[in-house]
């Protein structure tokens, strides 16, 4: 699977993580920081 960084217009899309673009699937994906989950790394897990 080819992966690139998301374009700059996606800055802030991932609240607690890094935005990556899955080229083959044409989908953006957030790689969350440790302790976070959710589509946009929006949830801290207790």
């Amino acid at each position: 699977v080819q992966i690139t960084k998301c374009s700059s217009d996606m800055d802030g899309y991932c609240l607690h993580g890094q935005c990556i673009y899955l080229v083959d699937m044409r989908e953006k994906f957030c790689r969350c920081e440790v302790g976070y989950t959710g589509l946009r790394c929006e949830h801290f897990f207790l």
């Epitope: 899955l22 994906f29 989950t37 959710g38 946009r40 949830h43 801290f44 897990f45």
Partner: antibody, heavy 118, light 112 residues
Framework: QVQLQQSGPELVKPGASVKISCKAS????????INWVKQRPGQGLEWIGW????????YYNPKFKGKATLTVDKSSSTAYMLLSSLTSEDSAFYFC???????????WGQGTLVTVSA | DVLMTQTPLSLPVSLGDQASISCRSS???????????LEWYLQKPGQSPKLLIY???NRFSGVPDRFSGSGSGTDFTLKISRVEAEDLGVYYC?????????FGGGTKLEIK
Amino acid sequence: QVQLQQSGPELVKPGASVKISCKASGYTFTDAYINWVKQRPGQGLEWIGWIWPGPVITYYNPKFKGKATLTVDKSSSTAYMLLSSLTSEDSAFYFCARREVLSPFAYWGQGTLVTVSA
Amino acid sequence: DVLMTQTPLSLPVSLGDQASISCRSSQSIVHSTGNTYLEWYLQKPGQSPKLLIYKVSNRFSGVPDRFSGSGSGTDFTLKISRVEAEDLGVYYCFHGTHVPYTFGGGTKLEIK
């Protein structure tokens, strides 16, 4: 309009498994979480977990890890919940509910009653 | 997990009265965005829960203005200014800030 249509009631034996469904319509299926909520007869609501349909991400309430397994079929815009090793404690209504990122449960399914009995 | 404690368990009211339900979280449910994802739902017998209030004080579309939500940090309140027959049922608070999400135990609003 957004609709979540759940499968019908299930009567299952202890130790067995059951798979219930929640068919979504009226919105883009891959644009919201499908959550599942348990309600034992006469009792309160318990949150089981959520699944984001694409790319698939799941999160389970630790209490339900190993009991519930959430999956989706994107082609039919349907979410599923498999409940395994059933006991009488699993007899309950199960609701699916749609939730966008950091948004409330604005839409709910009608509920599926699962009865576990020998 | 965040424990959501609702009081009272049962609330007998006369039609036209004001009703107040309290919900307390065991820890702060303020999100890193600064928002508080505290919601209120009403479940009538034999029905699915229905959204009333989200983000502490925002009424969902179609919800009458006699319903209001308030609070901050760990203490939240749902008020119904003039109770009508259609308001009877079980009210649940809910937090969606951290995972796992949790519901309060419910408050049954019933006729005195």
